[in-house]
């Protein structure tokens, strides 16, 4: 049913869903701080633009009585319950920030006639792609998939002279929310990744993964997994690995690789790490100091959600346009706005674009080094290190199938 929005006469409210089930186990206080920081900046920007309006946030808390798993498994109904709470209280703002779980976002989008924008820090799954009034401020699975296909096909770089068409995917069901949906997208038989690969097998058991490392009859040399170095070590330990194995470790929201004093452990030498460029993100700052890397990005996405709303509000007010219209709800895409750390670009479907970075471990320095970058906005790879000091033979990435000649 239609809910009246607190979104007119110079007073604009943001509804922030504070769900017990969240993509990351972030203390709600940190999210509140991020939202309040964003609000202050928005107020300043509007004031500087000569717009004398009020912008506030209403935090909508789940009672946590029924949906108390703390992760995304029981989030489907929690999101709808919170919407019902908003509806009963007649307290809908101009925009809804949250939820972060793919299940809840999908269900809320499906079960409501949304004439207002939804901004999500999360909602990584393919089922949340191409939603007209949904904006996602953390890299969704589709972006990862497009990178992987692009990289697999690349064969004209000094360090990658073979196109790849095969892969193993390790997915054991204990992944974090982001990893769960990233790997889910790679596993899905109808996904772009599956469509473009000739061979793909999902490894679900630790032993399957461990056996592949030295199996002479393996069908691919490439294994994709998701998590941090510690996760890989638990699985791989110090086991011997065939020299032409390449492990792609997806660890998008972890900044630790860029810290000055970090040395790559020996077990990372066969690994390429895919992460996000730290960009302007300042590691030496209190905003990130007390949060683990992934969580830092989560709070940052909430903050950027507030700044995005402020950006759109400013544009519409300056143009004398109404905020409670489908036009406003559909406007949160195909744009660049001033985020907390600098410009943030959203694609045609409201998904954040970013620079992904592929790192390798230098056998000389034992440091993580940038091999290449990938701009998700233009789907293009840019080589950085033309003569990497790889562990692989001739400082080139091996073919994906042992014994197969140049492609």
């Amino acid at each position: 049913s239609q809910v009246s929005q607190n979104c007119h006469n110079g007073s604009y409210e943001i509804s922030v869903l504070m769900m017990g089930n969240s993509a990351f186990a972030e203390p709600l206080k940190n999210l509140e701080d991020a939202v309040n920081e964003g609000l202050e900046i928005v107020r300043g920007r509007l004031q500087n633009a000569g717009l004398n309006v009020t912008v506030n946030a209403t935090f909508m808390y789940s009672d946590g009585l029924i949906h108390n798993s703390g992760d995304c498994r029981s989030s489907t109904c929690e999101g709808l319950d919170l919407l019902r709470k908003i509806s009963n209280a007649q307290r809908m703002g101009c925009v809804l920030i949250g939820p972060s779980c793919t299940y809840s976002t999908f269900q809320m989008y499906l079960d409501t006639e949304l004439s207002y924008p939804m901004i999500s820090a999360g909602s990584f799954g393919l089922s949340c792609d191409y939603k007209e009034t949904l904006t996602r401020l953390m890299s969704p699975a589709r972006k990862l998939m497009y990178f992987l296909v692009n990289f697999w096909k690349t064969n004209d770089l000094p360090f990658k002279t073979y196109s790849w068409s095969t892969s193993y995917v390790y997915k054991n069901g204990t992944e974090t929310e982001d990893c769960f949906w990233y790997l889910n997208a790679l596993e899905a038989s109808v996904s772009y990744f599956s469509h473009e690969l000739g061979f793909k097998v999902v490894l679900r058991q630790d032993k399957e993964f461990q056996d592949i490392l030295m199996d002479h009859n393996r069908k691919s040399n490439v294994i994709i997994m998701c998590g941090g170095p510690e996760f890989l070590y638990k699985l791989k330990g110090d086991r011997a690995v065939a020299e032409d194995i390449v492990i792609i470790l997806v660890d998008l929201f972890n900044d630790q690789y860029f810290e000055d004093n970090v040395t790559a452990p020996d077990y990372m030498k066969n690994v390429l790490v895919l992460t996000l460029s730290p960009g302007n993100s300042l590691l030496n700052s209190s905003f990130s100091r007390n949060l683990s890397p992934t969580k830092r990005d989560f709070a940052l996405a909430y903050l950027n959600g507030i700044l995005l709303f402020g950006h759109m509000l400013k544009i519409f007010l300056e143009n004398g346009e109404n905020i409670t219209t489908p036009k406003f709800a559909h406007a949160f895409r195909n744009l660049t706005f001033e985020g907390y750390d600098g410009p943030v670009t959203l694609d045609d479907w409201g998904d954040v674009d970013s620079t992904m970075v592929l790192l390798y471990t230098s056998v000389d320095t034992k440091k993580y080094k940038v091999l290449l970058t990938y701009d998700t906005h233009v789907n293009k790879t840019y080589p950085v290190d033309m003569s990497p000091t790889f562990t692989w033979k001739n400082s080139k990435l091996p073919n994906d199938i042992t014994g197969r000649g140049p492609q």
């Epitope: 701080d33 991020a34 309040n36 920081e37 964003g38 609000l39 202050e40 900046i41 107020r43 300043g44 920007r45 004031q47 500087n48 302007n280 993100s281 300042l282 030496n284 700052s285 209190s286 905003f287 001033e338 907390y340 750390d341 600098g342």
Partner: nanobody
Framework: QVQFVESGGGLVQAGGSLRLSCTAS????????MGWFRQAPGKEREFVAA????????DFADSVKGRFTISRDRAKNTVYLQMNSLKPEDTAVYYC?????????????????WGQGTQVTVSS
């Protein structure tokens, strides 16, 4: 052109207090983190305190923690550094600076606009 003017410096006895102000003109103030740095004669310019664009996050050098506080007033385009329990080693020229983004930062090269500085002298 963005300009910052510091004020509030002076001579004070050890254990005393001062409040430094940094007022901005010619630029959008609240989009940016702000910081205070200081430079004693013959020494490198060092970080003292910082505040984020929205004022929610603050950071301090270990040497001033618990003695100094930083705040900002959006309406007045001003950042304040309240300095209590001053020590002779706090003697320096204090500079305010604007960060390139709204984020809090203690790294000097993340700041692009600087004030002229105000002298603080703490006598024993």
């Amino acid at each position: 052109q963005v300009q910052f003017v510091e004020s509030g410096g002076g001579l004070v006895q050890a254990g005393g207090s001062l409040r430094l102000s940094c007022t901005a003109s010619g630029g959008i103030f609240s989009n940016y983190g702000m910081g205070w740095f200081r430079q004693a004669p013959g020494k490198e310019r060092e970080f003292v305190a910082a505040i984020s664009g929205g004022g929610v996050y603050t950071d301090f050098a270990d040497s001033v923690k618990g003695r100094f506080t930083i705040s900002r007033d959006r309406a007045k385009n001003t950042v304040y550094l309240q300095m209590n329990s001053l020590k002779p080693e706090d003697t320096a020229v204090y500079y305010c600076a604007r960060a390139r983004t709204a984020r809090l930062t203690s790294r000097r090269h993340d700041y692009d606009y600087w004030g002229q500085g105000t002298q603080v002298t703490v006598s024993s």
